[in-house]
Interface confidence: medium
Amino acid sequence: QSPPGKPEIHKCRSPDKETFTCWWNPGTDGGLPTNYSLTYSKEGEKTTYECPDYKTSGPNSCFFSKQYTSIWKIYIITVNATNQMGSSSSDPLYVDVTYIVEPEPPRNLTLEVKQLKDKKTYLWVKWSPPTITDVKTGWFTMEYEIRLKPEEAEEWEIHFTGHQTQFKVFDLYPGQKYLVQTRCKPDHGYWSRWSQESSVEMPNDFTLKD
């Protein structure tokens, strides 16, 4: 039996700059029941606070709701482990919520097969920003990628679309069913998960008109 090993803050993420969660990896428990607490202070403040919500984001996590989240303020976050033999603390993590955004995937992914005047067909892919993202006000600047592949293929073909929420894909195989997904990334932050797959079959004989 021994004091607990040093915990490590594994990651912190925000879906929207309005709330965020931090997760930690416990160290060794020293063979004894071990309690974990997350404490934090904000830059320029002397007060130390305890995690406001250990439940919402699951085990070994702390959820900061709107009332506990400020942007452009550095949070100095530490996880403490305590058992009967002693205690240990993680290295402090200095977190700026602005930079840890991992948004929800884009939504309303729609696929349309179109034809140019020269009879060349293409796939028109359109989508909307994630619901929580206030793109119009400039609160978020979002970049997007789409990926697609024939249903049976293993390799995805990825296209970066910049700030565009639509993209035209040419030179697809007629008669082939394609799977398409999209994802987004804020100006500072992480790529979202890929959206749910949408599928479309490229026609063998295209007779529709624009």
């Epitope: 594994h10 990651k11 912190c12 830059e43 320029g44 452009w72 550095i74 290295d91 993590l93 200095y94 977190v95 700026d96 602005t98 930079y99 840890i100 500072h188 932050g189």
Partner: antibody, heavy 122, light 112 residues
């Protein structure tokens, strides 16, 4: 414990090349921006380069732009500085440092290595 | 480039005295996001620099509260309320608001 260990320094002739490495441990390397800073024999400090946590964004001052390249291998937890067309004024102690803030933000070199010495002389 | 000018170059003090180091930038170092990325570093003899203060006035973890930073715009000050022997070394200011990031020339704190 955050640890940064530089290597690869030495004596090189003007016009020559050298590649510095910085082995990082004690933290999730891919979560942090990294910097190279140098200190001249006269003890003045100069920021030389930075690289974003994923490696997609780099920046250099004009004094080294086009001659130095910062890169990283997140799988190996290692930062690099490729220096070419070296000049005598590049003679310095080269330090790698880790951004204090998790993921983005700016500045604040919270952790430094012990440095590796580069001498450019014929 | 933003020029960072430190004064004095050398600061002789007696242990227990207050010390004050000034740093002036050639232009405002308020970033477009409203923050001021002004930092102070201490380099003790034979060691690499260590971060003391970030964003003008925030002490890095483990830095004693006798160190304090203040200022805004272009004028910044580092104060040490009661100098101890372990505080001796060269102090550098640094701006991380505008690229290229730049250091001051340093202030050597030494025993009178």
């Amino acid at each position: 414990e955050v640890k940064l260990v530089e290597s690869g320094g030495g004596l090189v002739q003007p016009g020559g090349s050298l590649k510095l490495s910085c082995a990082a441990s004690g933290f999730t390397f891919s979560d942090y921006y990294m910097f190279w800073v140098r200190q001249t024999p006269e003890k003045s400090l100069e920021w030389v380069a930075y690289i974003s946590n994923g490696g997609g964004s780099t920046y250099y001052p004009d004094t080294v732009k086009g001659r130095f390249t910062i890169s990283r291998d997140n799988a190996k937890n290692t930062l690099y500085l490729q220096m070419s067309r070296l000049k005598s004024e590049d003679t310095a102690m080269y330090y790698c440092s880790r951004q204090l803030f998790y993921y983005g933000s700016r500045g604040a070199m919270g952790y430094w290595g012990q440095g590796t010495s580069v001498t450019v002389s014929s | 480039d933003v020029l960072m000018t430190q004064t004095p170059l050398s600061l002789p003090v007696s242990l227990g005295d207050q010390a004050s180091i000034s740093c002036r930038s050639s232009q405002s170092i308020v970033h477009s996001n409203g923050n001021t990325y002004l930092e102070w570093y201490l380099q003790k003899p034979g060691q690499s620099p260590k971060l003391l203060i970030y964003k003008v006035s925030n002490r890095f973890s483990g830095v004693p509260d006798r160190f304090s930073g203040s200022g805004s715009g272009t004028d910044f000050t580092l104060k040490i309320s009661r100098v101890e022997a372990e505080d001796l070394g060269v102090y550098y200011c640094f701006q991380g608001s505008h690229v290229p990031f730049t250091f001051g020339s340093g202030t050597k704190l030494e025993i009178k």
